[in-house]
């Protein structure tokens, strides 16, 4: 990996915090859309978990070179309903394929400014970033 | 909040890296066990995704005060098989409830040592940490 310049002003202990805190979730680059393809809407009998799932999904790369981690992946559901355990292909309308979201801690590289406002290396700013982790087969909500 | 010491030696730009890079996955505190409770092995019709799933799970806290994020959650499957979409309670042996793992980027706070070996604040060391995100209903692998 190439090294990032650090967060520090050039004299003494830094007055800047290493991490600037913000807990406002940052939206992902694209809305975590559903991505239904009847051709891929099937549960495989081998391969990785996301293809053997009865709520199969694919991963979409979200890369930001000024963020740690630079690469995040968003799950995209391949079917609106769950696939039948029996056939692995026909959909069962009694089950929905729903995205599981998570607010992940990420760090953004931001310029740090010294006391005179001059640019002094980089600071890391902590943010919560919403990612979709997987698609899960759930029973539909029954409203009370 | 009071500031915690940064990663920087006290003179000039740091010779220490802000982030020490290491991609050796760190195992979670406990093995991501299955946690079968017949009483909770059911798919609810309301509540959060992890209780409505036909592969329901609970979350277990993993806290480390010298890690960012300090709190991580490991999924623990509540059923060995998937729950029937029809009843929400009986298990269907044609489907397995499997843990979905992810190597998450975390940062550990480590002492930094100046040129003379004296302690100068903290550095952050990047590691990959294996977490179980969810339980997914999958078709069992068919061995070729």
């Amino acid at each position: 990996y190439s090294h990032w310049p650090s967060c520090c002003p050039s004299k003494g202990y830094p007055s800047e915090e290493l991490l600037r805190w913000s807990t406002v979730p940052v939206p992902p680059l694209k809305p975590a859309s559903l991505d239904f393809h009847s051709v891929s809407c099937r549960a495989s009998e081998d391969g990785p978990l996301n293809s053997r799932a009865i709520s199969p999904w694919r991963y979409e790369l979200d890369r930001d070179l000024n963020r740690l981690p630079q690469d995040l992946y968003h799950a995209r559901c391949l079917c609106p309903h769950c696939v039948s355990l029996q056939t692995g292909s026909h959909m069962d309308p009694r089950g929905n394929s729903e995205l599981l979201y998570h607010n992940q801690t990420v760090f953004y590289r931001r310029p740090c400014h010294g006391k005179k406002g001059n640019h002094k290396g980089y600071c890391l700013e902590r943010r919560l970033y919403r990612v979709s982790l997987a698609c899960v087969c759930v029973r539909p909500r029954v409203m009370g | 909040y009071s500031h915690w010491p940064s990663c920087c030696p006290s003179k000039g730009y740091p010779s220490e890296e802000l982030l020490r890079w290491s991609t050796v996955p760190v195992p979670p505190l406990k093995p991501a066990s299955l946690d079968f409770h017949s009483v909770s092995c059911r798919a609810s019709e309301d509540g959060p995704l992890n209780s409505r799933a036909i592969s329901p799970w609970r979350y277990e806290l993993d806290r480390d005060l010298n890690r960012l994020p300090q709190d991580l959650y490991h999924a623990r499957c509540l059923c060995p098989h998937c729950v029937s979409l029809q009843t929400g309670s009986h298990m269907d042996p044609r489907g397995n409830s499997e843990l979905l793992y992810h190597n998450q980027t975390v940062f550990y706070r480590r002492p930094c040592h100046g040129k003379k070996g004296n302690h100068k604040g903290y550095c952050l060391e990047r590691r990959l940490y294996r977490v179980s995100l969810a339980c997914v209903c999958v078709r069992p692998r068919v061995m070729g």
Partner: antibody, heavy 125, light 107 residues
């Protein structure tokens, strides 16, 4: 102001279950972890476990694993602690306690900063 | 689990005295230690977190210090309202553990 109000005293037979409630007010319920601590008559404090009301994530003391279940109802800002297969040595005052987090940021410190008034559970045949 | 050993288990002191309670952890807890006060029939109350930081509204006669495995809680000048049982608690690692308590009485 922050308040934790617990349910009333209970008398239970050995082998039964008890469910204690803890209603929170005066703060964002989902923003703070809730701990459960018990105290047998004339004894010290014993931590049982905690729950994050936001995602239902828990951590239980090994001793209580399989017997304790901590849950929340976010809609009414209430935490619950259910203890099953009760024995006479489970006779105790059960407390809920909010876990505050303090600086220095970003490495927080944790302490039980607000406590419920306690619920006496008596297990007797 | 981390064991916390508090001493003494009880002590008697006069108003105005300096009172010291110690707490020893079975392993290094990196200053991740809290102190609580519990009066008879009441719920515990947080006094000090992270070894030495006073919680909001706690009088300055209370203080804490220590590092590694050994920690100290001090009341610089004992007041009648300080009669209570005091507990240390580590939060270095789950499960959290408490000391067995020190019962403080007035002579």
């Amino acid at each position: 102001q922050v308040q934790l109000v617990q349910s009333g005293a209970e008398v239970k037979k050995p082998g039964a279950s008890v469910k204690v409630s803890c209603k929170a007010s005066g703060y964002s319920f989902t923003g703070y972890t809730m701990n459960w601590v018990r105290q047998a008559p004339g004894q010290g404090l014993e931590w049982m476990g905690l729950i994050n009301p936001d995602n239902g994530g828990t951590s239980y003391k090994q001793k209580f694993q399989g017997r304790v279940t901590m849950t929340v109802d976010k809609s009414i800002s209430t935490a619950y602690m259910e203890l099953s297969r009760l024995r006479s040595d489970d006779t105790a005052v059960y407390y809920c306690a909010r876990e505050g987090y303090y600086g220095p940021s970003p490495f927080h410190h944790y302490a039980m900063d607000y406590w419920g008034q306690g619920t006496l559970v008596t297990v007797s045949s | 689990d981390i064991q916390m050993t508090q001493s003494p288990s009880s002590l008697s002191a006069s108003v105005g005295d300096r009172v010291t309670i110690t707490c020893q952890a079975s392993q290094d807890i990196s200053n991740y230690l809290n102190w609580y006060q519990q009066k008879p029939g009441k719920a515990p109350k947080l006094l000090i977190y992270y070894t030495s930081t006073l919680h909001t509204g706690v009088p300055s006669r209370f203080s804490g210090s220590g590092s590694g495995t050994d920690y100290t809680f001090t009341i610089s000048s004992l007041q009648p309202e300080d009669i209570a049982t005091y507990y240390c608690q580590q939060y270095s690692k789950l499960p959290y553990t408490f000391g067995q308590g020190t019962k403080l009485e007035i002579k």
